[in-house]
C-alpha cells in the first residue's frame, strides 16, 4: 500500500500527493486558536487504469463498466486528524481531534 | 454521514451508490470458489461544491485552489469485506475476509 | 452576550476625516476577521472593508481604496476606520460586523453609526 | 467582481403566504452565502449561512437552498413580523458584495 509523494517541481503526471498549507486566518477562520496553520496535502494527477488503486474492487467495477460509472479518481487514501483548539459557535472553546484533516497518501479509486 | 442510493430508474445526477452485481466467472476469475457472484454497487455522479462532502479538507484544498487540484470526485467512502473461499497461487484452498469489497456509502472527496 | 456598538459617526465638510470604532464585547475579540458595512438612506447594504484578526489580511471596496483605512486594536477589543477625503456619497450608516469566515460569513453586527458629508 | 442579482425587488404577500425571493451570482460561489433581514433603522440580522443552514434563534419558516449560482430564501408562511428587506451576500471572495435588496410589504 503506497502512493506517490510530489512537489511544485515535479514533473509527473500520475496521482500523487502534493505538499500544501493551509493558513486559517486567510480563510477568515480566525476563531481556530491552534493550529495557525498545518500542513494539509492534497491529490493530484492522472489515475491510469490499475496504477495506484487501493482495493479489488475498483478493478471490478472497471472491468463490469456499469452505466455511468467513470474511471478511478485521484483521491485521499488515507487521512489522518489533527488536534486544534477553537471558538465554537457559542463562544466555548472546544479542544478536539479532527478527523481527516492530513492527507497521508493519494491513490485512484 | 450519509449517501445516496440510487438505481438504474433513477434520475439522481449527484454523486450516488448504484447496485452492481459482480460475477467472478463472467470476468475469468475461475479460482474464487464462493461466492461466485457478490453484490458490489459502485459510485457514480456529480460532485457539486459542499454536496456529500465527507470532509472538511476536502473544504479547504477547494478554497486553497492549488495548482491541478481537481475538484472533489464521487468516490466510496464506506466499505466492507466479503468473507471468500479461493485457491492461491500455490493451489491452496484459503479461506478470507477479503477488505474494501462492497461499496456501503458513496462521497465526495 | 456577544456586542458590537459603534461610534464616531457624525457631521463632516466634504474632503475632511473622520474616524470611526467599534467597540467589542461578550466574544474573544482578537479571534476573529472583522468588517466595516455600510448603507445610504433608502438604499442597499455595501461592503466597505475586511480585517483579519492580526491583521495580516486587509481588503477594501474599490470605492474607498486609498481614502479609508482599516485597523484594530486587540487589546483594546476596537475596530477602527480612519476615513480620509470623506465626499458627499460617503454619506451613509456605518456598521461593524464580525466575520467567521469562509463558509461562514457575517453573524454578528453592530446597531451602526451615522455618517454626514455636507458643506 | 462577484455580481449578486436579488429578484424580485419588492412583493407585496399577506400574511400565511409562502414567499420566494432568488439570488443569482455571476460566477459560482459554491454555498458561501447568507440572508440577511433588516428592519427600518435597525442593523441586518442573519437567517441563513451556508445556503441552507438556519441561524440559531430563528423560526423555521425560514428555508435556504441553491449552491453555486442559484441561491432561493423561502419565508413557509409569511407572520407580521416578518415584513422587512431582505439581503444576500456573498462571502466566497473579496470584494464581499450583497444583492440589492428584496422589500416584503403588506398586501
Known amino acids: 500500500d503506497f502512493g506517490l509523494d510530489c512537489d511544485e517541481h515535479s514533473t509527473e503526471s500520475r496521482c500523487c500527493r502534493y505538499p500544501l498549507t493551509v493558513d486559517f486566518e486567510a480563510f477568515g477562520w480566525d476563531w481556530i486558536i491552534a493550529p495557525k496553520r498545518y500542513k494539509a496535502n492534497y491529490c493530484s494527477g492522472e489515475c491510469e487504469f490499475v496504477f495506484l488503486q487501493k482495493y479489488p474492487h475498483t478493478h471490478l467495477v472497471h472491468q463490469a463498466n456499469p452505466r455511468g460509472s467513470a474511471g478511478p479518481c485521484c483521491t485521499p487514501t488515507k487521512m489522518s486528524p489533527i488536534n486544534m483548539l477553537y471558538f465554537n459557535g457559542k463562544e466555548q472553546i472546544i479542544y478536539g481531534k479532527i478527523p481527516a484533516m492530513v492527507v497521508d497518501r493519494c491513490g485512484c479509486s | 454521514d450519509f449517501g445516496l442510493d440510487c438505481d438504474e430508474h433513477s434520475t439522481e445526477s449527484r454523486c450516488c451508490r448504484y447496485p452492481l452485481t459482480v460475477d467472478f466467472e463472467a470476468f475469468g476469475w475461475d479460482w474464487i470458489i464462493a461466492p461466485k457472484r457478490y453484490k458490489a454497487n459502485y459510485c457514480s455522479g456529480e460532485c457539486e461544491f459542499v454536496f456529500l462532502q465527507k470532509y472538511p479538507h476536502t473544504h479547504l484544498v477547494h478554497q486553497a485552489n492549488p495548482r491541478g487540484s481537481a475538484g472533489p470526485c464521487c468516490t466510496p467512502t464506506k466499505m466492507s469485506p466479503i468473507n471468500m473461499l479461493y485457491f492461491n497461487g500455490k493451489e491452496q484452498i484459503i479461506y478470507g475476509k477479503i477488505p474494501a469489497m462492497v461499496v456501503d456509502r458513496c462521497g465526495c472527496s | 452576550e456577544v456586542q458590537l456598538v459603534e461610534s464616531g459617526g457624525g457631521l463632516v465638510k466634504p474632503g475632511g476625516s473622520l474616524r470611526l470604532s467599534c467597540a467589542a464585547s461578550?466574544?474573544?475579540?482578537?479571534?476573529?476577521?472583522m468588517n466595516w458595512v455600510r448603507q445610504a438612506p433608502g438604499k442597499g447594504l455595501e461592503w466597505v472593508s475586511s480585517?483579519?484578526?492580526?491583521?495580516?489580511?486587509?481588503y477594501y471596496a474599490d470605492s474607498v481604496k486609498g481614502r479609508f483605512t482599516i485597523s484594530r486594536d486587540n487589546a483594546k477589543n476596537s475596530l477602527y476606520l480612519q476615513m480620509n477625503s470623506l465626499r458627499a456619497e460617503d454619506t451613509t450608516v456605518y456598521y461593524c460586523?464580525?466575520?467567521?469566515?469562509?463558509?461562514?460569513?457575517?453573524?454578528?453586527w453592530g446597531q451602526g453609526t451615522t455618517v454626514t458629508v455636507s458643506s | 467582481d462577484i455580481q449578486m442579482t436579488q429578484s424580485p425587488s419588492s412583493l407585496s404577500a399577506s400574511v400565511g403566504d409562502r414567499v420566494t425571493i432568488t439570488c443569482r451570482a455571476s460566477?459560482?460561489?459554491?454555498?458561501?452565502l447568507g440572508w440577511y433581514q433588516q428592519k427600518p433603522g435597525k442593523a441586518p440580522k442573519r437567517l441563513i449561512y451556508?445556503?441552507?443552514s438556519l441561524q440559531s434563534g430563528v423560526p423555521s419558516r425560514f428555508s435556504g437552498s441553491g449552491s453555486g449560482t442559484e441561491f432561493t430564501l423561502t419565508i413557509s408562511s409569511l407572520q407580521p413580523e416578518d415584513f422587512a428587506t431582505y439581503y444576500c451576500?456573498?462571502?466566497?471572495?473579496?470584494?464581499?458584495?450583497f444583492g440589492q435588496g428584496t422589500k416584503v410589504e403588506i398586501k
Open positions: 460586523a464580525r466575520d467567521r469566515g469562509y463558509l461562514y460569513g457575517m453573524d454578528v
Open positions: 460566477q459560482a460561489i459554491r454555498n458561501d
Open positions: 480585517i483579519s484578526s492580526s491583521s495580516s489580511y486587509i
Open positions: 461578550g466574544f474573544t475579540f482578537s479571534s476573529y476577521s
Open positions: 451556508a445556503a441552507s
Open positions: 451576500l456573498q462571502h466566497n471572495s473579496y470584494p464581499r458584495t
